[in-house]
């Protein structure tokens, strides 16, 4: 058997670090057998069999000119093997970050903090950490580790499925190359890394007969679980075209009626989502949707109650506003205490 331990990486390649002493090992001989060393394609003897170093070649303070293929020969001139030297650096701890778009799964991505110049792979795993007792800061022995399955095709990402919202996890990403391994440990809780995807299907419609109104509606992001235990709350921003500043409101559901739009001007609207108990952070903004308030007047006939687009208003009771209702279902919110000024203007 070969006296040379096979480092992780392609066969026949041995590794060293620039500026350090490097030992090359002749693979096809018995340990300690004296050999001669040559550079491939060069007749000059690098190290003879009388060096006292047996089957090894020592290169002091290796640099890039030492990279390449070496040949070792036994005393009788037989080929002991060929070795390719590649120089690089041991792994440095990778940089790791984790994010969650819902409360059941999270993903972690990593980048090398320093390029080693050598073949590199990553080992990814996680443990669940649990607290002992409600008022205790001590942690029980963690459970796991379990592998964090990596994306195919070499994307630097792994995903933990079926995570528990209230648990803490310790992520282990280890960078491995032929010169060693280096580990980054990252403690994450789903609550702190939760950032929903932006709401989808944003639509902005005029409200016929109301020249200062726009109705915006949207849906939950597709990535949010279909039957959620946790709801989302929303933040909506709108502004007239060419106006630099956004106005912000926090709707109670999946719809909002804007009552102070500028008549005749198109308005940009966008919406963002967050866990309704304020875990994590707000999503990025949805793509903007545009709408222009109606230019018409109130129709003479009062339509059926269900036809919300043209429903005229009744003076709302300002002293008893509806409680906020996080809801999966869109619910009409035409009436609002902010409406009274416009109502006077329209109905006068």
């Amino acid at each position: 058997s070969s006296p040379c331990p096979q480092a992780w990486g392609p066969p026949g390649v041995q590794y060293g670090q620039p500026g350090r002493s490097v030992k090359l090992c002749c693979p096809g001989v018995t340990a300690g057998d004296p050999v001669s060393w040559f550079r491939d394609g060069e007749p000059k003897l690098l190290q003879g069999p009388d060096s006292g170093l047996g089957h090894e070649l020592v290169l002091a303070q290796a640099d890039s000119t030492d990279e390449g293929t070496y040949i070792c020969q036994t005393l009788d001139g037989a080929l002991g093997g060929t070795v390719t030297l590649q120089l690089g650096y041991p792994p440095a701890r990778p940089v790791v970050s984790c994010q969650a778009a819902d409360y059941e799964n999270f993903s972690c991505t990593w980048s090398p903090s320093q390029i080693s110049g050598l073949p590199t792979r990553y080992l990814t795993s996680y443990r669940k950490k649990t607290v002992l007792g409600a008022d205790s800061q001590r942690r029980s022995p963690s459970t796991g580790p379990w592998p964090c399955p990596q994306d195919p095709l070499g994307a630097a990402r792994c995903v933990v499925h079926g995570a528990e919202f209230w648990s803490q996890y310790r992520i282990n990403v280890t960078e491995v190359n032929p010169l060693g391994a280096s580990t980054r440990l990252l403690d994450v809780s789903l609550q702190s890394i939760l950032r929903p995807d932006p709401p989808q299907g944003l639509r902005v419609e005029s409200v016929p007969g109301y020249p200062r109104r726009l109705r915006a509606s949207w849906t939950y992001p597709a990535s949010w679980p279909c039957q959620p235990h946790f709801l989302l709350k929303f933040r909506l921003q709108y502004r007239p075209a060419q106006h630099p500043a956004w106005s912000t409101v926090e709707p109670a559901g999946l719809e909002e009626v804007i009552t102070d739009a500028v008549a005749g001007l198109p308005h940009a609207v966008r919406v963002s989502a967050r866990d309704f108990l304020d875990a994590g952070t707000w999503s990025t903004w949805s793509p903007e949707a545009w709408g222009t308030p109606s230019t018409g007047t109130i129709p003479k006939e009062i339509p059926a109650w269900g036809q919300l687009h043209t429903q005229p208003e009744v003076e709302p009771q300002v002293d008893s506003p509806a409680p906020p209702r996080p809801s999966l279902q869109p619910h009409p919110r035409l009436l609002d205490h902010r409406d009274s000024v416009e109502q006077v203007a329209v109905l006068a």
Partner: antibody, heavy 118, light 107 residues
């Protein structure tokens, strides 16, 4: 020999913007994480921001998050710090520093002075 | 963020004296600690990395020790050129932090 040369500092009014550059030479720039560290007059050192070799991960001190952006151009061996909404407390000498790895600063530039004042 | 404290904040010693500075982290940082020297008007210079390793070219009178939360930096025999401010710095997590510094001068 590793060399890091910062530029782009100067006097700017509160609320203004500035872009710092760090020209690197003497090493394979695209292999290393890079960092900005600052030092207010008469004060200690404060880490500002770091970026991995690929640019794919960045990190910021809370004091500059949302206002400063770190970036790099590996083809030009240059590190950048875009500073917006500047405040008086951002007045400092800004140093560019390199790894190895993340958060360990083995080589430093000479620094460039940023003064935020009206 | 991990907080770093250093003591003393300043000290005066005679040439040839042994000088010791301590650094404490608010949580375990393993051995992910560096020590830097900064002279007035100059950039910082790395002296010690990974808590106890002497950077190439740094005189052997400088040394470091410790692990976890408590670390020590020592100048075995203070020289006039050692007048400077010394900083510890952790890099255990992704947001590195520096200690407030210790100013060293000659009596």
């Amino acid at each position: 020999e590793v060399q890091l040369l910062e530029s782009g500092g100067g006097l700017v009014q509160p609320g203004g913007s500035l872009r710092l550059s760090c020209a690197a030479s003497g090493f394979t720039f695209s292999w290393y994480s890079m960092t900005w560290v600052r030092q207010a007059p008469g004060k200690g050192l404060e880490w500002v921001s770091s970026i991995v070799p690929s640019g794919g991960h960045t990190q910021y001190a809370d004091s500059v998050k949302g206002r400063f952006t770190i970036s790099r151009d590996n083809s030009k061996n240059t590190l950048y710090l875009q500073m917006n909404s500047l405040r008086a407390e951002d007045t400092a000498v800004y140093y560019c520093a390199k790894g190895p790895g993340w958060g360990s600063f083995w080589q430093w530039g000479r620094g460039t002075l940023v003064t935020v004042s009206s | 963020d991990i907080q770093m404290t250093q003591s003393p904040s300043s000290l005066s010693a005679s040439v040839g004296d042994r000088v010791t500075i301590t650094c404490q982290a608010s949580q375990d940082i393993n051995n992910y600690l560096n020590w830097y020297q900064q002279k007035p008007g100059k950039a910082p210079k790395l002296l010690i990395y990974d808590a106890s390793n002497l950077q190439t070219g740094v005189p052997s009178r400088f040394s470091g020790s410790g692990s976890g939360t408590d670390f020590t930096f020592t100048i075995s025999s203070l020289q006039p050129e050692d007048i400077a401010t010394y900083y510890c710095q952790q890099y255990d997590n992704l947001s590195p932090t520096f200690g407030p510094g210790t100013k060293v001068d000659i009596k």
